[in-house]
Interface confidence: low
């Protein structure tokens, strides 16, 4: 349905509040270094322009595309060249190349200061003084640090952020009320950002077909009673939504996501019995709820898959007639029967099935050739099952912190060229799989663990892509989306790595460590552990454990000392010397 003015169409569909919020997110995700005030000014100008188009769709420039309007606006920023360097060259291009250029300059790890949380009273005062500015600032700060954050979902987070302040700033104990809510929003926000980053990487690096395959598998697990054609329709619509958001088309994305939620709720009888509660909620909550809804029960009497996909004499005919449709049906039928499998495993099985048909349908006796295809699935299923079993046992034995340390050592030995902050961040997140997934029963462990690991390893891939330092990381990240985790799991110690020169400064600590939160203190220790492994990649677990135990004792001792700084200086030297001796540095 063509509209004379796209900007007027979206303004009317979304309403002024959501329109302004989404334009702010879009601008902050593109120009991540721009001050808040500059963005607010640009958003206000765009909003005023949109209102003129709503009043008269034939008014000057109202017929321009959103990319043209937004790009023109971004290119009016005076300090573009000084602040963003070569990104300013994007402004010399025409649409659609200009937007593509802006997208390529999105920075997953922007050089921005860490967000420090002010005192609760300070935040509550700011909230009461100017609620609108306070909430806009939240959108801006999250969007510029997470340039691929799912925009309509960020509106949902902002709604919860506002609700937390509204409730807690009038509570008797403001801090007790507010801080746990903010911690929860922060943790959920990081997880949401990482999940969306994988969707965008899937679309941008591996194409629409890869994303659609992921979506068929996931939606078939979630809606096993829905028809294949119904699932296909949802996949098509969902792909459009995510393509738009990942492409910076946030107004279209939010609008289409709302339409999709509406469709799902109007057709829930033929989709899932689990949607009722979600569909009674307001729009933002509804969309979030649908995205997180539990899997529906599997139909009781599903026939064997072998009949249609192995035993039928028409397998090759059906495959040849419509390859992607037939493979889609295979993936749908397999996924709806296996909520206990990870999506990436289901995609590996579908790939194996496709490869077998490609080979066998050209053979003299196709049926004889593909008759045992399901036998090839067994090792693919057992590999993640065994890996999860072993790692959950290790997690239960060690606890989260020490399990993270085991992974830090494992991954530093695999890819020692990767920067220490990245190794610490990624290994800490990999380690969280234990507390997130190992508590689940067997039937839920694999989808929880392996699909979570896909999200975390994608963080490694996007951070590494910015400054590539390891061919092994590049290989695992680019060869196959669904085999990233097995690829990293299969990596052994990098024998080509030349150990890092020893630098005492890396292992010099000060009294400020004593005032850090437990989490920050862990990160300091884990940073030291990575550096140790980089200096001595052949160090044994026992050697590293001994050094880390000494280090923990040293920190504890000096933090209890009267003269902390002197203790850190003197005892630190002894610790470095003892560690060097222990590791033979």
């Amino acid at each position: 349905d063509a509209h004379k003015s796209e900007v007027a169409h979206r303004f009317k569909d979304l309403g002024e509040e959501n329109f302004k919020a989404l334009v702010l997110i879009a601008f902050a995700q593109y120009l991540q270094q721009c001050p808040f005030e500059d963005h607010v000014k640009l958003v206000n100008e765009v909003t005023e322009f949109a209102k003129t188009c709503v009043a008269d769709e034939s008014a000057e420039n109202c017929d321009k595309s959103l990319h043209t309007l937004f790009g023109d606006k971004l290119c009016t920023v005076a300090t573009l060249r000084e602040t963003y360097g070569e990104m300013a060259d994007c402004c010399a291009k025409q649409e659609p190349e200009r937007n593509e250029c802006f997208l390529q300059h999105k920075d997953d790890n922007p050089n921005l200061p860490r967000l420090v949380r002010p005192e609760v009273d300070v935040m509550c005062t700011a909230f009461h003084d100017n609620e609108e500015t306070f909430l806009k600032k939240y959108l801006y700060e999250i969007a510029r640090r997470h340039p691929y954050f799912y925009a309509p979902e960020l509106l949902f987070f902002a709604k919860r952020y506002k609700a937390a302040f509204t409730e807690c700033c009038q509570a008797a104990d403001k801090a007790a009320c507010l801080l746990p809510k903010l911690d929860e929003l922060r943790d959920e926000g990081k997880a949401s950002s990482a999940k969306q980053r994988l969707k965008c990487a899937s679309l941008q690096k591996f194409g629409e077909r890869a994303f659609k395959a992921w979506a068929v598998a996931r939606l078939s697990q979630r809606f096993p009673k829905a028809e294949f054609a119904e699932v296909s329709k949802l996949v098509t619509d969902l792909t459009k939504v995510h393509t738009e958001c990942c492409h910076g088309d946030l107004l279209e994305c939010a609008d289409d996501r709302a339409d999709l939620a509406k469709y799902i709720c109007e057709n829930q009888d033929s989709i899932s019995s689990k949607l009722k509660e979600c569909c009674e909620k307001p729009l933002l909550e509804k969309s979030h709820c649908i995205a997180e809804v539990e899997n529906d029960e599997m139909p009781a009497d599903l026939p064997s898959l072998a009949a249609d996909f192995v035993e039928s004499k028409d397998v090759c005919k059906n495959y040849a007639e419509a390859k992607d449709v037939f493979l889609g049906m295979f993936l749908y039928e397999y996924a709806r029967r296996h909520p206990d499998y990870s999506v990436v495993l289901l995609l590996r099985l579908a790939k194996t099935y496709e490869t077998t048909l490609e080979k066998c349908c050209a053979a003299a006796d196709p049926h004889e050739c593909y008759a045992k295809v399901f036998d090839e699935f067994k090792p693919l299923v057992e590999e993640p099952q065994n890996l999860i079993k072993q790692n959950c046992e290790l997690f239960e034995q060690l606890g989260e912190y020490k399990f993270q340390n085991a992974l830090l050592v494992r991954y530093t030995k695999k890819v020692p060229q990767v920067s220490t902050p990245t190794l610490v961040e990624v290994s800490r997140n990999l380690g969280k799989v234990g507390s997130k997934c190992c508590k689940h029963p067997e039937a839920k462990r694999m989808p929880c663990a392996e699909d979570y690991l896909s999200v975390v390893l994608n963080q490694l891939c996007v951070l590494h892509e910015k400054t590539p330092v390891s061919d092994r990381v590049t290989k695992c990240c680019t060869e196959s989306l669904v085999n990233r985790r097995p690829c990293f799991s299969a990596l052994e110690v990098d024998e080509t790595y030349v150990p890092k020169e020893f630098n005492a400064e890396t292992f010099t600590f000060h009294a400020d460590i004593c005032t850090l939160s437990e989490k920050e203190r862990q990160i300091k220790k884990q940073t030291a552990l990575v550096e140790l492994v980089k200096h001595k990649p052949k160090a044994t677990k026992e050697q590293l454990k001994a050094v880390m135990d000494d280090f923990a004792a040293f920190v504890e001792k000096c933090c209890k000392a009267d003269d902390k700084e002197t203790c850190f200086a003197e005892e630190g030297k002894k610790l470095v010397a003892a560690s060097q001796a222990a590791l033979g540095l």
Partner: nanobody
Framework: QVQLQESGGGLVQPGGSLRLSCAAS????????MSWVRQAPGKGPEWVSA????????RYAESVKGRFTISRDNAKSTLYLQMNSLKPEDTAVYYC????????GSQGTQVTVSS
């Protein structure tokens, strides 16, 4: 939007015949295998019969073999089920579905076999 509309049901005496039709729209009918599923009062859905996309390969549940015939007309995007020698135990709501599936995405048509 995917739509499946069944028709042709009704009340019939034991030993009688009915022909059910299912008009499909909103997807490429000729690319998909199709099935008939039925649900008797108070029971779960039961798969009845399936046909591949081209119409060459047909399958039947043991309970209907030799009495029911599934067919399709891809030009008309319509699926059929010819039901002969009907028995009281065939009484159910009949649904057409995409793929070999026992899930229901449509309204169905009531078939009652009674004297």
């Amino acid at each position: 939007q995917v739509q499946l509309q069944e028709s042709g049901g009704g009340l019939v005496q034991p030993g009688g015949s009915l022909r059910l039709s299912c008009a499909a729209s909103g997807f490429t009918f000729g690319s998909f295998g199709m099935s008939w599923v039925r649900q008797a009062p108070g029971k779960g859905p039961e798969w009845v019969s399936a046909i591949d996309s081209g119409g060459a390969d047909t399958r039947y549940a043991e309970s209907v073999k030799g009495r029911f015939t599934i067919s399709r007309d891809n030009a008309k995007s319509t699926l059929y089920l010819q039901m002969n020698s009907l028995k009281p135990e065939d009484t159910a709501v009949y649904y057409c579905t995409i793929g070999r599936s026992s899930s229901r995405g449509s309204q169905g048509t009531q078939v009652t076999v009674s004297s």
